[in-house]
């Protein structure tokens, strides 16, 4: 299709080389039409558009994204060529930063319903570059935490080193929806609830004598409880002896509950004690079996292909640890009689 009639928007993504971060592009179709595709209408309920030339389906994924190769080759369908870019409804998610993401991205409705629709497209020229501003050492992170029940704030990473007075007007989105009342470089939350969690996008306009472009940053916000003050506890095994049959396979499960920690580095491992020798066992990876705001239950199994006489004199020890401390539970195998 002819992209010469597409509206054009220029965006800048300045990424930090110190941290992982994501980026998003919204399919910013002309205002009246947008509601039919993406439900990201900026109009108030009282403002009804005069005409709705795009009579597309209300299916939220009803847009198509392309990338325009710089060498003039035909447009490429994003889904087929770029595994690190994911389309979610009307949003394009870039999972990894890098200058190779620079380029022109085009979105348009999938369903062409009227002659007007041909020109219904947006071309986004994205420039991606690493952050070079060393003067702002403590810029806000692209991952921010809000403590439930307390006051908190979400800072726009690209503006966090500027005072509120010198900060330009900022447009904020949460999970793709415009937050029309927020205009500063910081969103203040009086009391944090779990619904404050989500993907926030902050945009501001930067201009020079030639052109203007939108500087965008994405912030993943999670709502958290305070860090635990307790070491993890082992839920299973409970007993310190286990009846087994010699020659049969055996799986012993260790399940432990870890309280929430902002920096979470749980350790769960099995080791064997034989007389005063001990060694860690190569066992399958640990897996999270339940995760809540307050804690996480992690399980790790030890698998014996067949129980031998030697295993009866050994102790199988599950060791769990967080930043507060560690807990162990040992199991001695006992031969089943009869």
């Amino acid at each position: 299709f002819n992209i010469s009639g597409c509206s054009t928007k220029k965006l800048l993504w300045t990424y930090s080389t110190r941290s992982e971060e994501e980026f998003v592009l919204f399919c910013d179709l002309p205002e009246p039409q947008k509601s039919h595709f993406c439900h990201r209408n900026r109009l108030s309920p009282k403002q009804v558009p005069e005409h709705l030339p795009f009579m597309g389906s209300n299916d939220l994924s009803d847009v198509q994204w392309y990338q325009q190769p710089s060498n003039g080759d035909p447009l490429e369908d994003i889904r087929k060529s770029y595994p690190h870019i994911i389309q979610d409804k009307c949003t394009l998610h870039f999972l990894t930063p890098g200058v190779n993401n620079s380029g022109s991205y085009i979105c348009r409705p999938k369903m062409i319903k009227s002659p007007y629709d041909v020109a219904c497209c947006v071309k986004m020229i994205l420039e991606v570059k690493p952050q070079t501003n060393a003067s702002c050492e403590y810029s806000a992170s692209h991952k921010q935490d809000l403590l439930l029940g307390s006051t908190g704030s979400i800072s726009c990473p690209s503006l966090s080193c500027q005072s509120d007075a010198q900060s330009p007007a900022v447009t904020w989105y949460k999970n793709g929806k415009l937050l029309s009342v927020e205009r500063s470089n910081r969103i203040v939350v009086d009391e944090v609830y779990d619904y404050h969690q989500g993907t926030y996008v902050c945009d501001y306009t930067q201009s020079d004598t030639v052109s203007s472009w939108t500087v965008r940053a994405v912030v993943q916000v999670r709502t958290i409880v305070g860090d635990t003050k307790l070491k993890p506890d082992i839920l299973d095994p409970v007993e310190d002896t286990l009846e087994v049959e010699l020659g049969k396979p055996l799986t012993i499960s260790c399940k432990a509950r870890f309280g929430f920690e902002r920096v979470f580095n749980p350790v769960i491992k099995w080791y064997i004690k034989d007389s005063d020798l001990e060694w860690e066992v190569s066992v399958p990876e640990a897996k999270s079996i339940k995760s809540t705001l307050k804690d996480e239950i992690i399980e790790r199994n030890i698998i014996l292909e067949k129980v031998t006489q030697r295993d009866l004199r050994r102790k199988f020890v599950c060791f769990v640890q967080n930043s507060i401390g560690n807990t162990t539970q040992s199991v001695q195998l006992k031969e089943k009689r009869g």
Partner: antibody
Framework: SLEESGGGLVKPGASLTLTCTAS?????????MCWVRQAPGKGLEWIAC????????AYYASWAKGRFTISKTSSTTVTLQMTSLTAADTATYFC??????????????WGPGTLVTVSS | AIKMTQTPSSVSAAVGGTVTINCRAS??????LAWYQQKPGQPPKLLIY???DLASGVPSRFKGSGSGTEYTLTISGVQCDDAATYYC?????????????FGGGTEVVVK
């Protein structure tokens, strides 16, 4: 592999330190490092073992206690200090690793031995 | 203190025959028992560990059995290469004392 060094000819009453150097692995808590000796034409005689982990617990034959000392001097070397040597201590001294590897399988390794001769 | 008593001190066997060597511990060593083969001028070679488990690369004609204080090494289908001295050893190092004691050895002569 394991290699013993420090053997040779010494006079009765003298002291001697033997060193066992491990290559290809470093010490861990899943095995012991041991010393065993064998007098010419005689059987094997266990002297001592030391736990190769951080505990460093040492275990001795009753006849060796007090006169022989086993020590871990680095993550790859073990020594055997011998004092008040007599002709009866003349033997080939072997260093051995005994216990389990990191997967819990048995691991037994011996050095070639070093000869200690006690004679005036 | 653990004392290991090995019998007989010498045994003669024809090629293809069977040899049985016994080892008695003065106290329960909980199957921490190893059997070694030694040939002149060489360090010992592990045959059996934990009383009955065959060490890696050892032919299946070597068999260890026993528990508590009584242990046995059986060599069936004896071959010329089996001529050597065999030792049992307690590997219960962390027991009271003499946890690593060896038996006196059994010389196997193959005819």
């Amino acid at each position: 592999s394991l290699e013993e060094s420090g053997g040779g000819l010494v006079k009765p009453g003298a002291s001697l330190t033997l060193t066992c150097t491990a290559s290809g692995f470093s010490f861990s808590s899943s095995y012991y490092m041991c010393w065993v000796r064998q007098a010419p034409g005689k059987g094997l005689e266990w002297i001592a073992c030391i736990h190769a982990g951080s505990s460093g617990s040492a275990y001795y034959a009753s006849w060796a206690k007090g006169r022989f000392t086993i020590s871990k001097t680095s993550s790859t070397t073990v020594t055997l200090q011998m004092t008040s040597l007599t002709a009866a201590d003349t033997a080939t001294y072997f260093c051995a690793r005994d216990g389990y590897d990191d997967y819990g399988d048995p691991f037994n390794l011996w050095g070639p031995g070093t000869l200690v001769t006690v004679s005036s | 203190a653990i004392k290991m008593t090995q019998t007989p001190s010498s045994v003669s066997a024809a090629v293809g025959g069977t040899v049985t060597i016994n080892c008695r511990a003065s106290e329960d060593i909980k199957s921490y028992l190893a059997w070694y083969q030694q040939k002149p001028g060489q360090p010992p070679k592990l045959l059996i560990y934990d009383a009955s488990d065959l060490a890696s690369g050892v032919p299946s004609r070597f068999k260890g059995s026993g528990s508590g204080t009584e242990y046995t090494l059986t060599i069936s289908g004896v071959q010329c290469d089996d001529a050597a001295t065999y030792y049992c050893q307690s590997a219960y190092y962390s027991s009271s004392t003499d946890g690593g004691a060896f038996g006196g050895g059994t010389e196997v002569v193959v005819k």
